[in-house]
């Protein structure tokens, strides 16, 4: 399974990555976060490593992305799960895997699901198993909105920069 | 499975496709490549057919996309796999399917995985079988960077313009 | 399949295309539609509810999105399917699930598939089951073109705003 990250020095270099100065001076908020591979039983988003970044006002707060300015954003996320059968008798206990991007806004007193993907895995039938989930879409967001994720099956995540990520960019 | 092409006359018309020039004069590099359906045991990317295109500086070299100018790009790819059981005894030999978008840059002496999706298929259990993988994300890229793909399970690809593709656009 | 890329000369022509004088230079056509949850055995797209929207000239026509101005668009869609086994004997009847984004332009006498994803599910083996499909890519489209979807397995759709959607935005 791919687990190729960048060495610390390479990551440092990547953080100083050149930015395209377009002819017009409009800011283009964008963010790409990766799941911290050192946290095996949680999904902690990081922007200071590998290919991850926060640009033009995006910031991280309580494991959520903070929307820097009102507008339409394309929001996306991916997870990859893997596992083995628990035992020969495991066929009767399906494993529910799900990944969701949620919006928390001052407009609503709850987390609104924006993107949801789900899968039922039967580990006893298929050993080992692997499953990928990806989704993305355009949403009208307001400055200060919080974008977060919720995942069922976190212990089964394949945490690498290319398999588990979360991002957004202004259109 | 979709295999719908365009008639020669329609193809001729489509080649003269109008392009949107916005009020500001900035170029918007974009590319969409499709897997060559005439190459059954390899994945060769093409930009001169069907809905595929290279715009504003993108080019193909050694089956890789060359990044035309430094900046942030959304990079995406999809593959669809299909197959039948090998034999009644095939349940013991799982098939590993994977698709990865990789970056080769002068900064690093190796291919860095940007996007990875994986699946384990058990052909003996499910005959026939079909599986789709998609992924996409935003990355900071440098002029001259090479974007390529690596696929496990190439003989099982469903090669059509709407099922197997690879693209990128500048944000 | 017949070729519809831009030839060098056509690309040259396209670059000389006159600027579209929009009302202001910041128009960014975008649309995000959700499947109407009140229509259980059909997939009816709505833009006037929940997080859905039509912006800067996108419009609906006969359950299709109408392209507001010629240019390159990122087009995407997702569906989630779910189900239970029909009976203990259902293993012999696989369920074909598919979702496709199609382009209809009356220059062709058929719908051209742009994005296709497929899956074969064996309900007798896995009860209950869940499956997600997502795809998206960049396409050169013309003002007035119609983007629609075709789905196999509509009775199995999980119709919610975060699971079944269809959208596009101008690059």
């Amino acid at each position: 399974l791919p687990g190729v990250g960048l060495t610390p020095s390479a990551a440092q270099t990547a953080r100083q990555h050149p930015k395209m100065h377009l002819a017009h001076s409009t800011l283009k908020p964008a963010a790409h976060l990766i799941g911290d591979p050192s946290k095996q039983n949680s999904l902690l988003w990081r922007a200071n490593t590998d290919r991850a970044f926060l640009q033009d006002g995006f910031s991280l707060s309580n494991n959520s992305l903070l929307v820097p300015t009102s507008g339409i954003y394309f929001v996306y996320s991916q997870v990859v799960f893997s596992g083995k059968a628990y035992s020969p008798k495991a066929t009767s206990s399906p494993l529910y895997l799900a990944h969701e991007v949620q919006l928390f806004s001052s407009q609503y007193p709850f987390h609104v699901p924006l993107l949801s993907s789900q899968k039922m895995v039967y580990p006893g039938l298929q050993e080992p198993w692997l499953h990928s989930m990806y989704h993305g879409a355009a949403f009208q967001l307001t400055q200060g909105d919080q974008l977060s994720t919720h995942t069922d099956g976190i212990p089964h995540l394949v945490l690498s920069p290319s398999t588990v990520f979360f991002g957004a960019f202004a259109l | 499975l979709p295999g719908v092409g365009l008639t020669p006359s329609a193809a001729q018309t489509a080649r003269q496709h109008p392009k949107m020039h916005l009020a500001h004069s900035t170029l918007k590099p974009a590319a969409h490549l499709i897997g060559d359906p005439s190459k059954q045991n390899s994945l060769l990317w093409r930009a001169n057919t069907d809905r595929a295109f290279l715009q504003d500086g993108f080019s193909l070299s050694n089956n890789s996309l060359l990044v035309p100018t430094s900046g942030i790009y959304f990079v995406y790819s999809q593959v669809v796999f299909s197959g039948k059981a090998y034999s009644p005894k095939a349940t013991s030999s799982p098939l590993y399917l994977a698709h990865e978008v990789q970056l080769f840059s002068s900064q690093y002496p190796f291919h860095v995985p940007l996007l990875s999706s994986q699946k384990m298929v058990y052909p003996g259990l499910q005959e026939p079988w079909l599986h789709s993988m998609y992924h996409g994300a935003a990355f900071q890229l440098t002029q001259g960077d090479q974007l390529s793909t690596h696929t496990d399970g190439i003989p099982h690809l469903v090669l059509s313009p709407s099922t197997v593709f690879f693209g990128a656009f500048a944000l | 399949l017949p070729g519809v890329g831009l030839t060098p000369s056509a690309a040259q022509t396209a670059r000389q295309h006159p600027k579209m004088h929009l009302a202001h230079s910041t128009l960014k056509p975008a649309a995000h539609l959700i499947g109407d949850p009140s229509k259980q055995n059909s997939l009816l797209w709505r833009a006037n509810t929940d997080r859905a929207f039509l912006q800067d000239g996108f419009s609906l026509s006969n359950n299709s999105l109408l392209v507001p101005t010629s240019g390159i668009y990122f087009v995407y869609s997702q569906v989630v399917f779910s189900g239970k086994a029909y009976s203990p004997k259902a293993t012999s009847s696989p369920l074909y699930l598919a979702h496709e984004v199609q382009l209809f332009s009356s220059q062709y006498p058929f719908h051209v598939p742009l994005l296709s994803s497929q899956k074969m599910v064996y309900p007798g083996l896995q009860e209950p089951w869940l499956h997600s499909m997502y795809h998206g890519a960049a396409f050169q489209l013309t003002q007035g073109d119609q983007l629609s979807t075709h789905t196999d397995g509509i009775p199995h759709l999980v119709l919610s705003p975060s699971t079944v959607f269809f959208g596009a935005f101008a690059l």
Epitope: - | P18 | N48, G57, L60, L66, P68, Q143
Partner: antibody
Framework: EVQLVESGGGLVQPGGSLRLSCAAS????????IHWVRQAPGKGLEWVGY????????NYNEKFKGRATISSDKSKNTAYLQMNSLRAEDTAVYYC???????????WGQGTLVTVSS | DIQMTQSPSSLSASVGDRVTITCRAS??????VAWYQQKPGKAPKLQIY???HRYTGVPSRFSGSGSGTDFTLTISSLQPEDFATYYC?????????FGQGTKVEIK
């Protein structure tokens, strides 16, 4: 400057046909659709349909499907509206219009009056 | 088809008056509404699109608002050249439909 000039209006017998022309200038003809909109005397506006000269794509108001045909000739920078089986209620000023974004009727011709009467 | 109902059908006002015209859609159309001005014997002119965006060259005294089913065109200070008939149009779904018009006359 964008200019649209309609022609072909006049008196038509009930059951007859008409073919209206819309000559376009001042922009690249194949970059935008041409809409046809009509207005009965003293009444409101009614969208008939559009044609894209680039690819001959069309979209019609269902009310006019089968009776109206919208086409264009790239070589002449001209769009056409053909209407068959005309009735008295088809009496109207017929306008062609060029949008900016598809559903926004930004540029209009001067209109041509069609009178259906015996 | 979506029906667009305008009110009032006509109104009398004086130069300098604030004028408000409303338009109601038979179903929610998001913010997909445009407004046109038409003078006798002339073609309509686009004033407002997407409920609240002024088209190029339209004076700032014209403004639009609303979303869902209820929309408003406001002329903050009526000028002599503003006396005309105004039409709303939904651009949410085809067939794009217009209101029956509101005639703004000199009092």
């Amino acid at each position: 400057e964008v200019q649209l000039v309609e022609s072909g209006g006049g008196l038509v017998q009930p059951g007859g046909s008409l073919r209206l022309s819309c000559a376009a200038s001042g922009y690249t003809f194949t970059s935008y659709v041409i809409h046809w909109v009509r207005q009965a005397p003293g009444k409101g506006l009614e969208w008939v349909g559009y044609n894209n000269p680039y690819n001959d794509g069309t979209n019609y108001n269902e009310k006019f499907k089968g009776r109206a045909t919208i086409s264009s000739d790239k070589s002449k920078n001209t769009a056409y509206l053909q209407m068959n089986s005309l009735r008295a209620e088809d009496t109207a000023v017929y306008y062609c219009s060029r949008p900016t974004m598809l559903p926004w009727f930004a540029y209009w011709g001067q209109g041509t009056l069609v009178t259906v009467s015996s | 088809d979506i029906q667009m109902t305008q009110s009032p059908s006509s109104l009398s006002a004086s130069v300098g008056d604030r004028v408000t015209i409303t338009c109601r859609a038979s179903q929610a159309v998001s913010s997909a509404v445009a407004w046109y001005q038409q003078k006798p014997g002339k073609a309509p002119k686009l004033q407002i699109y997407s409920a609240s965006h002024r088209y190029t060259g339209v004076p700032s005294r014209f403004s639009g608002s609303g979303s869902g089913t209820d929309f408003t065109l406001t002329i903050s200070s009526l000028q002599p050249e503003d006396f005309a008939t105004y039409y709303c149009q939904e651009h949410y779904s085809t067939p794009w439909t217009f209101g029956q018009g509101t005639k703004v006359e000199i009092k």
